[in-house]
Structures are given as structure tokens and as C-alpha cells.
């Protein structure tokens, strides 16, 4: 299944309408001559306006019934109040092939590639290569890890410039997170395995993990008409 | 193209010891995990052990841990097994082959290097 | 451990015949499967890996399927140069283990 279809129905609109000319950006001299053809012409104007809020207002409920369509097709969490406007925050679930971990999603690649390969598969597909904020994520990740002999890159590769390991976000590694086995020198980034991180070589065509944060979504939800 | 060429095999008393190498060319060697596969005269193949391109991580199968060790030295382009305590099973042709980590098969083969230990 | 084991152990075939060979995981292995050519006294050629991808430069006759724990290697016009010792090898966990091997002979 084509993940980038996934997301793309994932990304809700927070407005449910589409884009539309308003009544008021109507060209003001259309409405302007003799009494008949200002008669005339305010008729047709009146017809217009009606006709484009009839539009808009299609529109607007094709397109709320297509978002619920997605909604319920990707198994989004998200349960509506049917008696009246709320405003609340929501949390979406992972799509297909992705794993949660707490509040994130993790996909597995199960091919190999370099770092620089992984890190652009990871944007292909709205992620980015894994970023691990403590000790206690890395054993959890490492939990899902099925074998030692696996090796999986993450979004962290050693700066040259700055001579320190540096995350994909542009922060720098606190040495208490992660215990990196190997050196820390040119062209080397970071993956991990069932149970320990290593430094390699970044041409390295190993495994890669992709996350995607869940977040809570401002979730607009209509009364039944 | 890809050249791997094992040596260091030979005859070997019960208990000696032994030190295979493997000299690579034609490709980045330090890009690549590398393994050993033996295969017992008329038998099939064995996987030995594996070493990621780094050498940080290393894998043994159960039946040579704690008696063989893999290593590498990418700045010579030669990857080495040192056999300890061997023992009459551990007779075989030693094969060094370009792979190994999940999931990855050996895409590289050496020709092979016979151990026999025998006294 | 996950075993794999091949069948037939051996075949006689001729020159032109179509071959199937069998490789059976003890657990499912996905499509973590690769197959090797070995002729006497070389060392194995990787010919099909991920179950059913050709390695480059390696000729169209040979075709790999299969999923889970069944897969096959077969070659559709047998050529000389075929007559060989074929092994399946998965790469799922470890340790990684290979079939017994399968002997392809001339009849």
C-alpha cells in the first residue's frame, strides 16, 4: 500500500470549507448603470451570490463528509459530539505499518540503505529518521527490535564543524543519553540494535527507523442537521 | 569488482589454535559487515560469525562463542577470525563472504581456506 | 534456531528440463530467503535473495517464490552449466542457517 496516500488522507484540513470568493470580492461595478439595467444586473447579483453560497455550502458539507470518510477509513480515534460545536483536542492513531511508541510512530524499513538514503526515504514519506530523547525511549525502541543481528539507523550523525555527534533537529547529543560504541569521527552516524548504539561508517547500507510524532489535533466538529 | 582472498588455514592439533585472514579489494571495505562461513568436507554451509563494517558488533553461532573471535582492520581492508581451542568439528573450509547483517545475504565469496584439526 | 530444509536432497535431470527445488523454514521467515549455487570445489554464488529478486547478472531461467515458510527456486531450461549443489539460506534471525542443500545431476 502506498504510505503517502495514508498521510495525505491524514492531513485534515482545519478548515472544513474550501477556498472561495466571497460575495464582497464581487467586481463593484457590475452593480452600476440605468434603473432597468440596475434592476437588471442587482437580479443577476442576487443570483450569483445565491448560487455561489449554494456552492459553498455543498461544498462544505461534500467536503466535511469526505474528512469523516477518511477518518473512518484510517481508523482515526476521534469521537464526535453529535448535539452541538465543540472544540477539542484529538489524537491520531498510527497509519498502517507504522508502530506506536507512546506518542510517537515508528516504521521499520525492512530493506537496507545508507544514512543519507534512509534520512531522504524518511521525508519521502512526511517522518523523519528516529530522534531519542532518553535512555528510557532507547530501551523501549530497542524492545521492538526482534533480532540482534539487526542494525537500524537513527537521526544522528557526527559534525565535523561542531566535533560533536549532532541530532537531524540540529541538537546536540547530551553524553548521559546514549552509550555509543565506536568513534566519533568524520562520516560516521549512529544506529541501534536489540541492545546496544554503535557508530558506523554512514555509506553503511543497514536498516533505518522513521518516526512521526503524534500529536493532538484541533478537531472542529459539526452539529447534525 | 569485488576480490576476497582467505588465508592461514592449515593443519592444527586438537585444542591448538589458528588465525584466518581475509584480504578484500574493489570495493569500501569499512561500508560493508563481513562473515565467516565454514563448510565440513561433504557437508553444507555453516554460518560462523559476523562483524558490522565499524567492528563494533559482532555475532558468533553457539557452536564456535567463546572459542572464536572476529575482527577487522578496515585500514588494511582484511577481516580475520582467531580459533581457539579447537576441535575436530571445527574442520571445515573457512569462508569469508561480504554480508551478513539482517537482511542482507553474501553477496561476495573468497575461494576458501581449509582448516583441519587433527592429531 | 530455525531450521530450513530442502527437498528433493538430490535430482537427476536433463538438459532443457524445467527444476523446482523446495526450501521449507520451520518458521515463518517473511521473505528473508536467499538461494545459493555451489559447484565442486568453488565457493557459493549468491544467486536470489529477498525470496524472488534475481542478483544482478545472474540469467533470467532462474526464478525464486514463495512467502512465509514455502519457497521455491526453479530453472526453467536447465543448461549445462547448471548441474550444481543449490542451498536456501534465510536471513531473518539468528543464527542464520542454511538447508541441507539440494544436488542437481546430469541424468
Known amino acids: 500500500m502506498d504510505q503517502q496516500a495514508i498521510y495525505a488522507e491524514l492531513n485534515l484540513p482545519t478548515d472544513s470549507g474550501p477556498e472561495s470568493s466571497s460575495p464582497s470580492s464581487l467586481p463593484r461595478d457590475v452593480c452600476q448603470g440605468s434603473p432597468w439595467h440596475q434592476f437588471a444586473l442587482k437580479l443577476s447579483c442576487a443570483g450569483i451570490i445565491l448560487l455561489v453560497l449554494v456552492v459553498t455550502g455543498l461544498s462544505v458539507s461534500v467536503t466535511s463528509l469526505i474528512q469523516k470518510s477518511s477518518i473512518e477509513k484510517c481508523s482515526v480515534d476521534i469521537q464526535q459530539s453529535r448535539n452541538k460545536t465543540t472544540e477539542r483536542p484529538g489524537l491520531l492513531n498510527c497509519p498502517i505499518y507504522w508502530q506506536q511508541l507512546r506518542e510517537k510512530c515508528l516504521l521499520f524499513s525492512h530493506t537496507v540503505n545508507p544514512w543519507n538514503n534512509s534520512l531522504a526515504d524518511c521525508s519521502t514519506k512526511e517522518s523523519s529518521l528516529l530522534l531519542i530523547r532518553d535512555k528510557d525511549e532507547l530501551i523501549h525502541t530497542q524492545n521492538l527490535i526482534r533480532d540482534k543481528a539487526i542494525l537500524f539507523w537513527i537521526g544522528l550523525n557526527f559534525s565535523l564543524s561542531e566535533k560533536n555527534w549532532k541530532w537531524i533537529n540540529g541538537s546536540f547529543l547530551n553524553s548521559n543519553d546514549l552509550e555509543i560504541r565506536g568513534d566519533a569521527k568524520e562520516n560516521s552516524c549512529i544506529s541501534i540494535s536489540q541492545t546496544s548504539v554503535y557508530s558506523e561508517y554512514c555509506s553503511t547500507e543497514i536498516r533505518w527507523i522513521c518516526q512521526k510524532e503524534l500529536t493532538p489535533v484541533r478537531n472542529k466538529v459539526y452539529p447534525d442537521s | 569488482e569485488v576480490q576476497l582472498v582467505e588465508s592461514g588455514g592449515g593443519l592444527v592439533q586438537p585444542g591448538g589454535s589458528l588465525r584466518l585472514s581475509c584480504a578484500a579489494s574493489?570495493?569500501?571495505?569499512?561500508?560493508?559487515?563481513m562473515s565467516w562461513v565454514r563448510q565440513a568436507p561433504g557437508k553444507g554451509l555453516e554460518w560462523v560469525s559476523t562483524?558490522?563494517?565499524?567492528?563494533?558488533?559482532?555475532y558468533y553461532a553457539d557452536s564456535v562463542k567463546g572459542r572464536f573471535t572476529i575482527s577487522r582492520d578496515n585500514s588494511r581492508n582484511t577481516l580475520y577470525l582467531q580459533m581457539n581451542s579447537l576441535r575436530a568439528e571445527d574442520t571445515a573450509v573457512y569462508y569469508c563472504?561480504?554480508?551478513?547483517?539482517?537482511?542482507?545475504?553474501?553477496?561476495?565469496w573468497g575461494q576458501g581456506t581449509l582448516v583441519t584439526v587433527s592429531s | 534456531d530455525i531450521q530450513m530444509t530442502q527437498s528433493p536432497s538430490s535430482l537427476s535431470a536433463s538438459v532443457g528440463d524445467r527444476v523446482t527445488i523446495t526450501c521449507r523454514a520451520s518458521?515463518?521467515?517473511?521473505?528473508?530467503l536467499n538461494w545459493y549455487q555451489q559447484k565442486p570445489g568453488k565457493a557459493p554464488k549468491l544467486l536470489i535473495y529477498?525470496?524472488?529478486s534475481l542478483l544482478s547478472g545472474v540469467p533470467s531461467r532462474f526464478s525464486g517464490g514463495g512467502s512465509g515458510t514455502d519457497f521455491t527456486l526453479t530453472i526453467s531450461s536447465l543448461q549445462p552449466e547448471d548441474f550444481a549443489t543449490y542451498y536456501c539460506?534465510?536471513?531473518?534471525?539468528?543464527?542464520?542457517?542454511f538447508g541441507q542443500g539440494t544436488k542437481v545431476e546430469i541424468k
Open positions: 574493489g570495493s569500501t571495505f569499512s561500508s560493508y559487515a
Open positions: 563472504a561480504r554480508g551478513g547483517l539482517i537482511p542482507s545475504g553474501f553477496d561476495y
Open positions: 562483524i558490522s563494517g565499524s567492528g563494533g558488533s559482532t
Open positions: 518458521q515463518s521467515i517473511s521473505s528473508y
Open positions: 539460506q534465510q536471513t531473518y534471525s539468528t543464527p542464520l542457517t
Open positions: 529477498a525470496a524472488s
